[in-house]
Amino acid sequence: GDLLIQKTIKKQVVLEEGTIAFKNWVKTGTEVYRQFWIFDVQNPQEVMMNSSNIQVKQRGPYTYRVRFLAKENVTQDAEDNTVSFLQPNGAIFEPSLSVGTEADNFTVLNLAVAAASHIYQNQFVQMILNSLINKSKSSMFQVRTLRELLWGYRDPFLSLVPYPVTTTVGLFYPYNNTADGVYKVFNGKDNISKVAIIDTYKGKRNLSYWESHCDMINGTDAASFPPFVEKSQVLQFFSSDICRSIYAVFESDVNLKGIPVYRFVLPSKAFASPVENPDNYCFCTEKIISKNCTSYGVLDISKCKEGRPVYISLPHFLYASPDVSEPIDGLNPNEEEHRTYLDIEPITGFTLQFAKRLQVNLLVKPSEKIQVLKNLKRNYIVPILWLNETGTIGDEKANMFRSQVTGKIN
């Protein structure tokens, strides 16, 4: 009966050697792909000289296989019923799933110029930077290959800076041969309703990036949730990519390869301004760019990125306020393509399919003392790329799941 199934499920979703959950948790059996679309700037000179709207044209997908490496340093702690681990990063380019090669060129914002002018706001330092920008023949925009843009390149301007700075720049640099964590999560042995919920991240229960409740590490890493998920639940999870915890709400029932799953989506409310969603007050970290915390749909994660002015949003500024996208031409947000969803099998709490979508933007501001930014009349949150990370349970695994889990219940 139901009790027996519940008992079996509770046993099999515990994160310890010998369970179905553990095997799939250590190394995902699902192929995960990360597709990138790069925003190629069409009018760099007009923007730099006249502060025109930035005309972008997305190019992609450029696809990489990710999350294929097993978790490392997996250590059980019997005392507090947790398991700790590192999640290694790796990306392999998939030419057959891409529109071009890693050598394709793109005109994008000069990451180093935008970041340095933001980090060093002292006018004297900006004048020093200006002379180095000019000397290195750098400008507001640059042409970079996909490989350089994503994984790193030696910046000619930063290479001239006479004090210690990292001279390699890339949106995901460093990535290969690095790991995310240490994560310490509850293994569920003593309390199955806590399974996979993060206890600490990098040894702390808070992030130190935000004020108040915004700084909390809530829920799981979204790969799974405690079993017996209800449609009424708000599923909390932490995403290190966006340096914050977020949540998903039930949207619809979906049939995935014969398995009934619940589709949970990130609601627009999660991206709302504190005016609309007061809970979000602590994600508003400054008053100028956010227009006194009335702008919405972009998240300033500079504190999490060594002061670099990185803003995270949904692709094409989906769910963002008009003032954010107004200076950018060529964006076409739509929910179907650009929102994030998780398809969760409710009995086990396993995420059997997901699409995580986000956009990486960089703030660039006018600067009196930096020639290449001198003619700007306004701030721009410049889209650099958006990504779609997807994973779907394989046919074989789906069959196994149907026979061992959902089939037994039905």
Epitope: Y120, N122, Q123, V125, M127, I128, S131, P162, Y163
Partner: antibody, heavy 118, light 107 residues
């Protein structure tokens, strides 16, 4: 109140070196650029260079490269300028001057007279 | 390097008169010009900063104008306490450069 207190007058021999100090108070030392300015007797002002204590970034007027070295001691909120291989041409009043946000040379020290004489 | 040519080198004016000092730069510096007053035995004092901005506490008889390469500093209704040397400073680029100075005396 922001104050810049410079060290006293110096009488030095040709070929020698001298190190002038500028002790600051009443502000966050690391956040503002400290400049040094030369004024020869009866002449105009010349910018020697500046230092941003926060990260040690310095920039010199080409004319004073090799002549002046700017340093800071954050623990005592003091800026220093060392002048080397002194000649009579280096006899002058030297000022330290501090910026205020986006305002150049908003605060000045009282000046240090350096006299180079055999 | 931007050179700054200041004129006149000296001038003698009567109390109550209007004083005009000019600085011309060798490159376009937008409105990045500053003006300083130096009285004998004292360090210079900032009167007007970039963008022709009168500093707090500075009397309104002092003003400046100009953009690009041509800049003018004005004292309306000269007072005896205005006897000093006056310097302009361009702050558009490094090295920062001063004008040669103007010695103002009372007739």
């Amino acid at each position: 109140e922001v104050q810049l207190q410079q060290s006293g007058p110096e009488l030095v021999k040709p070929g020698a070196s001298v190190k002038i100090s500028c002790e600051t108070s009443g502000h966050t030392f690391t956040e503002y650029t400290m400049h040094w300015v030369k004024q020869s007797h009866g002449k105009s002002l010349e910018w020697i260079g500046g230092i941003y204590p926060n990260n040690g970034a310095t920039k010199y007027n080409q004319k004073f490269k090799g002549k002046a070295t700017l340093t800071v001691d954050k623990s005592s909120s003091t800026a220093y300028m060392e002048l080397r291989s002194l000649t009579s041409e280096d006899s002058a009043v030297y000022y330290c001057a501090r910026d205020r946000y986006d305002v150049w040379f908003a605060y000045w020290g009282q000046g240090t007279l350096v006299t180079v004489s055999a | 390097e931007t050179t700054v040519t200041q004129s006149p080198a000296s001038l003698s004016m009567a109390i109550g008169e209007k004083v005009t000092i000019r600085c011309i730069t060798s490159t376009d510096i937008d409105d990045d010009m500053n003006w300083y007053q130096q009285k004998p035995g004292e360090p210079p004092k900032l009167l007007i900063s970039e963008g022709n901005t009168l500093r707090p506490g500075v009397p309104s008889r002092f003003s400046s104008s100009g953009y690009g390469t041509d800049f003018v500093f004005t004292i309306e209704n000269l007072l005896s306490e205005d006897v000093a040397d006056y310097y302009c400073l361009q702050s558009d680029n490094l090295p920062l450069t001063f004008g040669g100075g103007t010695k103002l005396e009372i007739k």
